[in-house]
């Protein structure tokens, strides 16, 4: 079947990185500066991608792949492709249309973007507060008040939370 | 308040230079992720991109154009300039400034422009 | 470069109705695709970027859709203030703008 289509179409022969030249009896040239053709049998070659601007280049062009851009220093991407770069705020902080902005009391933003998100409840299961939140970090819920031995003087803190992928010491 | 004013249009002699300029408020044009183009409006005509520079002094050109533009700043007066060579009459048309992206977030596009300025070239 | 065709050229419509603009690129360009309204003696207004995201302040009834070479401006009830001309903008490969449409009153 390969070489059935190819003795139909001299275009199928062309490999990625060039095109079908159809100014030159259908021979394989390769794909000017700033274009690319990532596929074999293609008649035109596409003009890259070029970051530009808050973009900038994570992959270079190539003759058989586009360009890839992220977000200059400062900002993140988003959207597909990395459409668009969104402001970077401070922990503690979101953004708005003004700016970024301080989270409420009662709220926190442990990253760079996103929402300031609500503290955890920790009555809702029936847990109390060990550690209050502040506008960086959420609370740490602790024993529920009724799992403490009566007449204890002092709760033992939990053990530091390892990482992800960490054994203990 | 992003403001971007536009000055330096008016008439000038076919073959002759202009230098335009745009006084930037709002915004600091050296901020990062910030990046200001130069794009134009021949009369009764599409829009047409001229040039882009960005916080960090990289330039972009339209091809066609490349050989007569030059793109420039001056950070301290914060104030975008586009010298342009050769005139000729099909030059003529309202030149805009215009700021890349919004306040927060940024891409390939133009949210604040200036309200331009016209130059005619004819003799 | 990458070239953007706009149809129609022009059109007239009446208040009320449904306004559908095309924009067609000679090749992929992701979401990278805004559109601006102008009207005549003012600089452009940016209605819509990232292909579909409405920029601040604009009206619900403009709407935009589309990915790779096919994009799509729709008004969705136009209104007295909405008669003006119309521009695609593509900001994948350096920049360019569509030949434009008007809107005129029918």
């Known amino acids: 079947f390969e070489r059935t289509r190819s003795l139909q179409d001299p275009c199928s022969n062309c490999p990625a990185g060039t095109f079908c030249d159809n100014n030159r009896n259908q021979i394989c040239s390769p794909c000017p500066p700033n274009s690319f053709s990532s596929a074999g049998g293609q008649r035109t070659c596409d003009i890259c991608r070029q970051c530009k601007g808050v973009f900038r280049t994570r992959k270079e062009c190539s003759s058989t792949s586009n360009a890839e851009c992220d977000c200059t220093p400062g900002f993140h991407c988003l959207g597909a492709g990395c459409s668009m770069c969104e402001q970077d705020c401070k922990q503690g902080q979101e953004l708005t249309k003004k700016g970024c902005k301080d989270c409420c009391f009662g709220t926190f933003n442990d990253q760079k973007r996103g929402i300031c998100r609500p503290w955890t409840n920790c009555s809702l299961d029936g847990k109390s507060v060990l550690v209050n939140g502040t506008k960086e970090r959420d609370v740490v819920c602790g024993p529920s008040p009724a799992d403490l031995s009566p007449g204890a003087s002092s709760v033992t803190p939990p053990a530091p939370a390892r990482e992800p992928g960490h054994s203990p010491q | 308040e992003v403001q971007l004013v536009e000055s330096g249009g008016g008439l000038v002699q076919p073959g002759g230079s202009l230098r335009l300029s745009c006084a930037a408020s709002?915004?600091?044009?050296?901020?990062?992720?910030?990046?200001v183009a130069w794009i134009r409006q021949a009369p009764g005509k599409g829009l047409e991109w001229l040039a882009l520079?960005?916080?960090?002094?990289?330039?972009r050109y339209s091809t066609s154009l490349k050989s007569r533009l030059t793109i420039s700043r001056d950070n301290s007066k914060n104030t975008l300039y586009l010298q342009l060579n050769s005139l000729r009459a099909e030059d003529t048309a309202v030149y805009y400034c215009?700021?890349?992206?919004?306040?927060?977030?940024?891409?390939?596009?133009?949210?604040?422009w200036g309200q331009g300025t016209l130059v005619t070239v004819s003799s | 470069d990458i070239q953007l065709t706009q149809s129609p050229s022009s059109l007239s419509a009446s208040v009320g109705d449904r306004v559908t603009i095309t924009c067609r690129a000679s090749?992929?360009?992701?979401?990278?695709l805004a559109w601006y309204q102008q009207k005549p003696g003012k600089a452009p207004k940016l209605l819509i970027y990232?292909?579909?995201n409405r920029a601040t302040g604009i009206p619900s009834r403009f709407s935009g859709s589309g990915s790779g070479t096919d994009f799509t401006l729709t008004i969705s009830s136009l209104q007295p203030e909405d008669f003006a001309t119309y521009y695609c903008?593509?900001?994948?490969?350096?920049?360019?703008f569509g030949q434009g449409t008007k809107v005129e009153i029918k």
């Open positions: 090749q992929g360009i992701g979401t990278y």
């Open positions: 215009a700021r890349e992206g919004s306040t927060t977030v940024v891409g390939d596009w133009f949210d604040y």
């Open positions: 520079i960005d916080w960090d002094d990289d330039k």
């Open positions: 903008q593509q900001g994948y490969s350096l920049w360019t």
């Open positions: 709002g915004f600091s044009l050296s901020t990062s992720g910030v990046a």
């Open positions: 990232d292909a579909s």
